[in-house]
Amino acid sequence: VPRWRQQWSGPGTTKRFPETVLARCVKYTEIHPEMRHVDCQSVWDAFKGAFISKHPCNITEEDYQPLMKLGTQTVPCNKILLWSRIKDLAHQFTQVQRDMFTLEDTLLGYLADDLTWCGEFNTSKINYQSCPDWRKDCSNNPVSVFWKTVSRRFAEAACDVVHVMLNGSRSKIFDKNSTFGSVEVHNLQPEKVQTLEAWVIHGGREDSRDLCQDPTIKELESIISKRNIQFSCKNIYRPDKFLQCVKNPEDSSCTSEI
């Protein structure tokens, strides 16, 4: 008789999840010599321990604490780049500007990026069929709690000038319900962070509007100012040129506005 299994609304665990996490860990430690001491088997065991045999709607930050301990890493606090709804460009940027870091440039962020995972209460099985959806099922699911935990701690670590890349093509350029809007903004430490600088990335080539005047950006400015952090905003009218100029800042065309 086939065992009854909870059906959730979201996609199931990414196929070959254990192998993927382990392989990513090994690759990361090879690329980053300062992390070569990391025992990737222990990292996987701690990751697995956070959600295996636990109800996938009952996950807590504490469940991920053993993994957090193993992911200890130096991140220059004044070189942090946050992003919202524009991950690819943010990652392209830090691949060129190697001294800046998104969360996914850290070991823990790199391990989990674009993956889904969940288990089942009282069994050691990984659920490859379905996992809880944040809206339709529950918010305290393994993936959401992981990202909330690491995002909060990443924001708490930031200092001086913190940058955030925002998608100017979205109806809500700043979305209070995004991870940036709901977690990171509220965990920047006013005693450490002087300024949040938003980079609003334009989508259309002919778009010359000042998106820093967008109502949602004004909302962000208000939230940040109330937290005693200064706010500044820049339009990035040409993201392709922006990246090119990060690669080649001496290029003569890079003195004009991008």
Partner: nanobody, 117 residues
């Protein structure tokens, strides 16, 4: 600007004790959780212990549990690490840092602890 100054390191024999201190300035000390992290020669950064802003909650790496005790004196803006039953594998530069990790940007020079017979 956040500034930290670690002290108390030295050369001891296995089984002996040391007490590290970290004087902090530049922010409201009691508002921040704090951690001790260490870096052994040729190794990466290892989280050792953390303490909440009030001092009411503490946590330790498995490798030091039962031997090390973290504490703080918020009136003196100082963080402590009492290290007992020291082992050769505890040899490292010890840093204090704000937050509980896993992301650290330690500001001090650290204090070197060498455990050797």
């Amino acid at each position: 600007e956040v500034q930290v100054l670690e002290s108390g390191g030295g050369l001891v024999q296995p089984g002996e004790s040391l007490r590290l201190s970290c004087a902090v300035s530049g922010f409201t000390f009691s508002n921040f959780a704090m951690s001790w992290v260490r870096q052994a020669p040729g190794k990466g950064l290892e989280w050792v212990s953390g303490i909440s802003g009030s001092g009411g909650s503490t946590d330790y790496a498995d490798s030091v549990k039962g031997r090390f005790t973290i504490s703080r004196d918020n009136s003196k803006n100082t963080l402590y690490l009492q290290m007992n039953s020291l082992r050769a594998e505890d040899t490292a530069v010890y840093y204090c840092a704000d937050g509980t990790g896993p992301f650290f940007d330690y500001r001090g020079q650290g204090t070197l602890v060498t455990v050797s017979s």
